[in-house]
Amino acid sequence: TLNSVLNSNAIKNLPPPLGGAAGHPGSAVSAAPGILYPGGNKYQTIDNYQPYPCAEDEECGTDEYCASPTRGGDAGVQICLACRKRRKRCMRHAMCCPGNYCKNGICVSSDQNHFRGEIEETITESFGNDHSTLDGYSRRTTLSSKMYHTKGQEGSVCLRSSDCASGLCCARHFWSKICKPVLKEGQVCTKHRRKGSHGLEIFQRCYCGEGLSCRIQKDHHQASNSSRLHTCQRH
């Protein structure tokens, strides 16, 4: 069950200030955050986990990936899980911790030493789930070794958004992923109506920037559901 996965091996930690960095939700071994209880004047810790639901890896932290907490688990339950360290099994790059990538089902180091100039590596894109691509085949993309050491500029190949420079995110473009600009106010955005639909995009857009949300454009409220245009709008 979800709780048994989430509530095993709890570690209590010293709590941060309210509104600051807290513990890690939904991993096998995790810190429980401190919370300032209303009416109280001291922090206490919680000896259980805080599952953080997600639809894709980008909604999780850089040290996490999005997946069902149990093998063959409920498709509607995906949470942020701790990334996998070197030599751990993986199905895609985002499962591996920063500085590693998924090769032949194992997280391996992406250190400079492991690359000789440019190498060809398989990027298996997940279109809706961890196990399949759009046509069942892996796409091959050339990755430059330097992408792991300098933040990618717009158009650079990436594995995750943390590979890209500030103001950019890592988004699907054909069969690879490249750094694209985070969307600004007024720009068209994609609102995923159902879980998993983000995986079908060949040209994926970034998310809206801080302080913006993807909403139906005011003058499109009367339009049919399928033709509604979403743009990044201020709160």
């Epitope: 807290a22 939700p25 955050p33 980008e58 999780c60 040290d63």
Partner: nanobody
């Protein structure tokens, strides 16, 4: 300043229903997961339910699965918890929480950073 305000709590008989609401202000929450937690007297605060920013993924505590439903309205910046078939053991203060946006905003860990003050739910037998 970020504010989460819960409402909808109250006294209800076992088997009854309540709908909690959590209104968010001071920040755009449509890009962030939101959750409900509860704390009964003399017990630690526990997870109840959470929902992803898109509403596409939800998670529930085993104790409420099939009885409680979490939903959100991003246009209204509100998250809801529909509680059916309430039991006396559901009696607690219910807290709304909002997440931080994960790697989208440079965080290494996705987590709940903001909390409401809570609303009391009492289920009598």
């Amino acid at each position: 300043e970020v504010q989460l305000v819960e409402s909808g709590g109250g006294l209800v008989q076992a088997g009854g229903s309540l709908r909690l609401s959590c209104a968010a202000s001071g920040r755009t929450f449509s890009n962030y997961p939101m959750g409900w937690f509860r704390q009964a007297p003399e017990k630690e605060r526990e997870f109840v339910a959470a929902i992803s920013w898109s509403g596409g993924s939800t998670a529930y505590a085993d104790s409420v699965k099939g009885r409680f439903t979490i939903s959100r309205d991003n246009a209204e910046n509100t998250v809801y918890l529909q509680m059916n078939s309430l039991k006396p053991e559901d009696t607690a203060v219910y807290y709304c929480a909002a997440g931080n946006g994960g790697r989208n905003y440079g965080h290494s860990r996705a987590r709940y950073d903001y909390w409401g003050q809570g609303t009391q739910v009492t289920v009598s037998s």
